[in-house]
Amino acid sequence: SPGQGTQSENSCTHFPGNLPNMLRDLRDAFSRVKTFFQMKDQLDNLLLKESLLEDFKGYLGCQALSEMIQFYLEEVMPQAENQDPDIKAHVNSLGENLKTLRLRLRRCHRFLPCENKSKAVEQVKNAFNKLQEKGIYKAMSEFDIFINYIEAYMTMKIRN
Amino acid sequence: SPGQGTQSENSCTHFPGNLPNMLRDLRDAFSRVKTFFQMKDQLDNLLLKESLLEDFKGYLGCQALSEMIQFYLEEVMPQAENQDPDIKAHVNSLGENLKTLRLRLRRCHRFLPCENKSKAVEQVKNAFNKLQEKGIYKAMSEFDIFINYIEAYMTMKIRN
């Protein structure tokens, strides 16, 4: 909707300026649990190698970041919270900061495009469902338009 | 693996040349069912409007195309096959052509990056799982590295 579009544009306008603050909030939250976990980590090899950074910077950047945020929120932090009652609230707070960051990144679409759904596709699906059986005929009868659109997409990718 | 990488590179090298053939195959397959479905479509308004083309060409292009291919393969074609016994094989053949196209697009990563998983993320997850409880400590203790990587990603996006 236009309203959403405007909100998204505003998010994008202010976002770069907010970036240092959001990262500072994340670092502050992490500083409260850092010692606890680093003391327990007895292995000097790295988990987050620079190959991950390379993927973040490459064509899979969005997926890599999205997956890593999900990995921390769904796999790492729920288990980390249970390591010690004193640490639980701080890990939770760190998770909330990470969720806030993800929300901001999602709002400004160009930062996490891979997590956004195409509105046009949603409209196609809604129209298709409303048409019931007639939707099958229409979707199939327009398949050559779909081929034209695929061609346009692929031509653009080749040019880029 | 390196082998896969080479295969992928080869796919990408030959892909642009194969594009017209793949689209021709799709159009040929569609021509065999076109009349059947267009005859049954009694509405002259469009389902696949150009807002979809715009999404294909925009930052959500990969997701939009990926979702639309899935929509046709999982929702439209299975129902279309059941419209008439004479048409079933032709619809099936059209679906196979679409699957082949998707497979080729996936193999040459830059065409459907949103469907590819980050290898680095997979390696992180594998290493994390192998470490069992120690993985929690390592993943949490390296969270500041993760923040640095996030910062690098966002800085790159702002610059772009």
């Epitope: 327009e142 034209n148 | 009349t35 267009q38 005859m39 002259d44 469009l46 150009e50 083309l53």
Partner: antibody, heavy 118, light 107 residues
Amino acid sequence: EVQLVESGGGLVKPGGSLKLSCAASGFTFSDYYMYWVRQTPEKRLEWVATISDGGSYTYYPDSVKGRFTISRDNAKNNLYLQMSSLKSEDTAMFYCARGYYYGLFTYWGQGTLVTVSA
Amino acid sequence: DIVMTQSHKFMSTSVGDRVSITCKASQDVNTGVAWYQQKPGQSPKLLIYWASTRHTGVPDRFTGSGSGTDYILTISSVQAEDLALYYCQQHYSTPYTFGGGTKLEIK
């Protein structure tokens, strides 16, 4: 009710240019492919141009390719036909039509007359 | 280009008669044929498409048939208001082409 009203026709010299317009109402203009079809003084009908719903795709027969340009303004619900290098054989009644995307003309306007003569 | 031929330029009939207007394509158009009616001083109106599908609001005395290259528009019981020019058109492939028209005259 679907309404298509053409305008812009008139007398023009060979080699000249003319721009036709078609004002659409009674339907969601941006949901449809649109067309120009002409009818010669001998009453022969000829498809002249097609434009897709958003204007990204345009199609013409060889007889007008390179001379005629179809365009649309979805915000104004208007269809256009820019004609240049006009010839006497372009003399015709020009109709704007709505239809299926594969060249089936469901609704027609009343037409605007174009006469190309010295 | 596909050439659509309407062999009769004129057809004369009486009110209540059954009349068939024919159209031949230069190649198979796979039932991708439409019929239009143009009354004097008016623009063409779609009657039939896909050879046999009646357009919205078209009286059921108008029926279309045919396949391959041969197509027929039939008016089962001609009315005075059916005095008009009738065109066939192929919408099977570009360029879309029309027949020369058949003028239906009422005796």
